[in-house]
């Protein structure tokens, strides 16, 4: 079948924009670290890169293949306020490269890390 | 309390980067429209803007206040393959402005639409 060049171009553009790669996302600090419900952070979120996007096949998942760690300083507030907001420096995982992996590859990668 | 200017600057930067605003995201076409399980799209995802980011209070949600619609052409594949991939043009919601709304404001907005 022959398809209009414009259609093919726009589809190719969509492929590129949605590919599996590190993307800037907002991470809820409290949820990321499962902190106590009486502890809050200001700002409540930080911006980091995490793998995201779509893979060509349903059996594949977009996963990080390398990670760096970013230190960010935030204000921590504990209720009831025994003291004012205190600056805390927290380290966040920042995905630097990604790959579409089969679900079994993901399983193997995860289990090889937790067995160490 | 007096805080280091660098700390305040980096925190302010984090606030700005994580604020509630339209963000480029990948949308799974099949999931967005709840299509039949034997229908696939190539690419499976499209890139659109959706509201995202964090609000200053737990009682608030980042919601769209205005939306445009983008038409995108994709290949639709139906299994079993009675014919080759056919180009289809689909309209996707693209959030153009956002606001942090209380959960009840979200309720009001949603329920006023479905009552029309």
């Amino acid at each position: 079948a022959h398809y209009n060049t414009e259609i093919l171009k726009s589809i190719d553009n969509e492929w590129r924009k949605t590919q599996c790669m590190p993307r800037e996302v907002c991470i809820d600090v409290g949820k990321e670290f499962g902190v106590a419900t009486n502890t809050f952070f200001k700002p409540p979120c930080v911006s980091v890169y995490r793998c995201g996007g779509c893979c060509n096949s349903e059996g594949l998942q977009c996963m990080n293949t390398s990670t760096s760690y970013l230190s960010k300083t935030l204000f921590e507030i504990t209720v009831p306020l025994s003291q004012g907001p205190k600056p805390v420096t927290i380290s966040f995982a920042n995905h630097t490269s990604c790959r579409c992996m089969s679900k079994l590859d993901v399983y193997r990668q995860v289990h090889s890390i937790i067995r160490r | 309390a007096h805080y280091n200017t660098e700390i305040l600057k980096s925190i302010d930067n984090e606030w700005r980067k994580t604020q509630c605003m339209p963000r480029e995201v990948c949308i799974d076409v099949g999931k967005e429209f709840g299509v039949a399980t034997n229908t696939f799209f190539k690419p499976p995802c499209v890139s659109v803007y959706r509201c995202g980011g964090c609000c200053n209070s737990e009682g608030l949600q980042c919601m769209n206040t205005s939306t445009s619609y983008l038409s995108k052409t994709l290949f639709e594949i139906t299994v079993p393959l009675s014919q080759g991939p056919k180009p289809v043009t689909i309209s996707f919601a693209n959030h153009t402005s956002c606001r942090c709304m209380s959960k009840l404001d979200v309720y009001r907005q949603v329920h006023s639409i479905i009552r029309r």
């Epitope: - | 209380s102 009840l104 979200v106 009001r108 329920h111 479905i114 009552r115």
Partner: antibody, heavy 118, light 112 residues
Framework: QVQLVESGGGVVQPGRSLRLSCAAS????????MHWVRQAPGKGLEWVAI????????YYADSVKGRFTISRDNSKNTLYLQMSSLRAEDTAVYYC???????????WGQGTLVTVSS | DIVMTQTPLSLSVTPGQPASISCKSS???????????LYWYLQKPGQPPQLLIN???NRFSGVPDRFSGSGSGTDFTLKISRVEAEDVGVYYC?????????FGGGTKVEIK
């Protein structure tokens, strides 16, 4: 006309569970948010929970959070309140009420009495 | 949580005379959409509550015009221009600007 009929109330021991139902008729149930409101004997009104028209969002009063679950079945035009770990202070008449766009209530059922007692 | 304070606690009125109930909220009920989410309900003896007034001053369908609501921000009033025997019961104000929704403690109206 709008009708809401609660059922499922009764006497229950502390720590036990109970499920209340509210049968709705006279309006398109699937287009309305719904609430549960309660009233302890001789006391004022206390809002308990809200559920969105499609069941996608639910919010609760702190006094019942983690113990009560609001749900709905739009195919049966029925609202539910699953109550667990019941306490003496949950003794009340429980009303279901239809939500307005403003998130208040316009029509109420007659109520069903829940008594938590050993 | 927003605290709703109603006064008086009870009211004894002669038929045909006016009555007034006050409701004060601990914070403004004026929302960013320009609406004020304050409602009035009447609970007659042995019955469920019924909606009287929507968003401060709008009478709900079927509510007699002797009932009127007014106010703004944090101060609201329900007035009955001429009390009738059927108006007895407990009146409640409600805020729905934010969760949790909260009611006033109620004002009991009886006939002298």
């Amino acid at each position: 006309q709008v009708q809401l009929v609660e059922s499922g109330g009764g006497v229950v021991q502390p720590g036990r569970s109970l499920r209340l139902s509210c049968a709705a008729s006279g309006f398109t149930f699937s287009r309305y948010g719904m609430h549960w409101v309660r009233q302890a004997p001789g006391k004022g009104l206390e809002w308990v929970a809200i559920i969105w028209y499609d069941g996608s969002d639910k919010y609760y009063a702190d006094s019942v959070k983690g113990r009560f679950t609001i749900s709905r079945d739009n195919s049966k035009n029925t609202l539910y309140l699953q109550m667990s770990s019941l306490r003496a202070e949950d003794t009340a008449v429980y009303y279901c009420a239809r939500g307005t766009v403003g998130a208040s209530f316009d029509y109420w059922g007659q109520g069903t009495l829940v008594t938590v007692s050993s | 949580d927003i605290v709703m304070t109603q006064t008086p606690l009870s009211l004894s009125v002669t038929p045909g005379q006016p009555a007034s109930i006050s409701c004060k909220s601990s914070q403004s009920l004026l929302n960013s959409d320009g609406k004020t989410y304050l409602y009035w309900y009447l609970q007659k003896p042995g019955q469920p509550p019924q909606l009287l007034i929507n968003e401060v001053s709008n009478r709900f369908s079927g509510v007699p015009d002797r009932f009127s609501g007014s106010g703004s921000g944090t101060d609201f009033t329900l007035k009955i221009s001429r009390v009738e025997a059927e108006d007895v019961g407990v009146y409640y104000c409600l805020q729905s600007i934010q969760l949790p929704l909260t009611f006033g403690g109620g004002t009991k109206v009886e006939i002298k």
